[in-house]
């Protein structure tokens, strides 16, 4: 009878597995090939994180991950002779990295950042429970277009929250927004446990408010034309147009996904301008319009942060009360 294929020989474990941190939140594991691997073996390395996440089989003797170092993270690595996931790898070797030491109750909480109009990032946090009220905080940040880690200079206070803002301008490089900003907050005296965050540049984007350029009536329709905030193209934004009528005391809100200026009533070919027609508006009454915008999922991961409202603009006549 024809016997099955001979069982694959298990490879020896990898050697010299080590771990280091680059920038603020880039964790890199490196290792050496196993000693005494069989000569007819084309070495591949199987690796996964401690919770069996992100399995990977690759020929490189390194693996990196961008992760906020707020908790311990471990990588297990083994060697094998093929890319076949069903092949049993060598004994797995594990190497872990722990967050910086310190009382967890001293670490800041709610560390969050918002990228304002793709021009500056504003981060805020709450002090840790177990800290002195006069703690002086420092925020460090890094992203790919920076050569080194930078310290944020503009620390401020908003109520119970501390914050810091730094310039971050969208680079024309098409891959810029596929990256993240790495953030760390600690205190000057080194008494608190540092806190980390990673802010993807496709999320937490808050545009500036739009600017209403023109309101005009055509029959019983109100034509609204506005300028979008700088740095955004109109197809990447959603809009909310609010119209308040002083006579009827109605308050209409229109959620606008596309705001093209295709109607002949609109001024044409004005760059970065959007338009919307509000139907059934009484021209002989006072109508007040304001608009806000937010990023949409066509261009961004996040669509939750509305801009502030634009300045109001009014059209029509206020009727005399009799």
């Amino acid at each position: 009878g024809g016997g099955g294929a001979a069982p694959t020989e298990t490879q020896p474990p990898v050697t010299n597995l080590s771990v280091s941190v680059e920038n603020l939140c880039t964790v890199i594991w490196t290792w050496n090939p196993p000693e005494g691997a069989s000569s007819n073996c084309s070495l591949w390395y199987f690796s996964h994180f401690g919770d069996k996440q992100d399995k990977k089989i690759a020929p490189e003797t390194r693996r990196s991950i961008e992760v906020p170092l707020n908790e311990r993270i471990c990588l297990q690595v083994g060697s094998q002779c093929s890319t076949n996931e069903s092949e049993k790898p060598s004994i797995l070797v594990e190497k872990c990295i722990s967050p910086p030491e310190g009382d967890p109750e001293s670490a800041v909480t709610e560390l969050q950042c918002i990228w304002h109009n793709l021009s500056y990032m504003k981060c805020s946090w709450l002090p840790g429970r177990n800290t002195s009220p006069d703690t002086n905080y420092t925020l460090y940040y890094w992203h790919r277009s920076l050569e080194k880690i930078h310290q944020c200079e503009n620390i401020f206070r908003e109520g119970q929250y501390f914050g810091c803002s730094f310039d971050l301008t969208k680079v024309k490089d098409s891959s810029f927004e596929q990256h993240s900003v790495q953030i760390m907050v600690k205190d000057n005296a080194g008494k608190i446990k540092p806190s980390f965050n990673i802010v993807p540049l496709t999320s937490r984007v808050k545009p500036d408010p739009p600017h209403i350029k023109n309101l005009s009536f055509h029959n019983d329709d109100l034509y609204v034309q506005w300028e979008n905030p700088q740095n955004f193209i109109s197809r990447c934004l959603f809009y909310e147009v609010e119209v308040n009528n002083s006579q009827t005391e109605t308050h209409n809100v229109f959620y606008v996904q596309e705001a093209k200026c295709e109607n002949p009533e609109f001024e044409r070919n004005v760059e970065n301008t959007s338009c919307f027609m509000v139907p059934g508006v009484l021209p002989d009454t006072l109508n007040t319009v304001r608009i806000r915008v937010k990023t949409n999922k066509l261009c961004y991961e996040d669509d939750k942060l509305w801009s502030n409202w634009s300045q109001e603009m009014s059209i029509g006549k206020k009727r005399n009360s009799t």
């Epitope: 709610e110 709450l126 429970r129 009220p133 908003e158 119970q160």
Partner: antibody
């Protein structure tokens, strides 16, 4: 003037529910945590629950965990305390307090009385 | 949880007298201790924050001291309007806790 004002108290049977509201004014609402503290008749103060300014951090006393839910609507400058499965020992005046700095209460409301009785 | 024990529970004093109320924490809380005054049928009011810092608008006769586990609220030259319950409160760790209160009565 900075102030907080509680409402929604009343008489409820054991096992019943009640929702308290705390309306705030005079400060930038989403920059401050708000806390519910209660005081049973003739007794001392007992911390109940806290919600941070942005609403990401929420804490409860063990005595109410799983029964009470704190929430906030920053567009309405209001914090809520949803109280379910009420017991006689929940009878108290419920105060809403604004937190400042490292977690002290600088502004208190007048309180709203919750009575749990059959 | 951190237990705060106040003493005395009750004190009857005459105007102009100096009053001392102590608050002891079951473990060290640094300076995260605050004092409140509650007059009958009123809500509490903040007197002292961070163990020794007077809150704005509070009369200068009220002062606080201490750190770690032992804290003191002192009222120099008591006035009739100071008849109230006084509570200490720790914010060093959750759950927040209050002392059981000290009731001051004016003779």
């Amino acid at each position: 003037e900075v102030q907080v004002l509680e409402s929604g108290g009343g008489l409820v049977q054991p096992g019943g529910s009640l929702r308290l509201s705390c309306a705030a004014s005079g400060f930038t609402f989403n920059n401050y945590a708000l806390t519910w503290v209660r005081q049973a008749p003739g007794k001392g103060l007992e911390w109940v629950s806290t919600i941070s300014g942005r609403g990401y951090s929420i804490y409860y006393a063990d005595s109410v965990k799983g029964r009470f839910t704190i929430s906030r609507d920053n567009s309405k400058n209001t914090v809520y305390l949803q109280m379910n499965s009420l017991r006689a020992e929940d009878t108290a005046v419920y105060y809403c307090a604004k937190e400042e700095g490292h977690w002290f209460f600088d502004v208190w409301g007048r309180g709203t009385l919750v009575t749990v009785s059959s | 949880e951190i237990v705060l024990t106040q003493s005395p529970d009750f004190q009857s004093v005459t105007p102009k007298e100096k009053v001392t109320i102590t608050c002891r924490a079951s473990q060290s809380i640094g300076s995260s201790l605050h004092w409140y005054q509650q007059k009958p049928d009123q809500s509490p009011k903040l007197l002292i924050k961070y163990a020794s810092q007077s809150f704005s608008g509070v009369p200068s006769r009220f002062s606080g001291s201490g750190s770690g586990t032992d804290f003191t609220l002192t009222i120099n030259s008591l006035e009739a309007e100071d008849a109230a319950a006084y509570y200490c409160h720790q914010s060093s760790s959750l759950p927040y806790t209050f002392g059981q209160g000290t009731k001051l009565e004016i003779k």
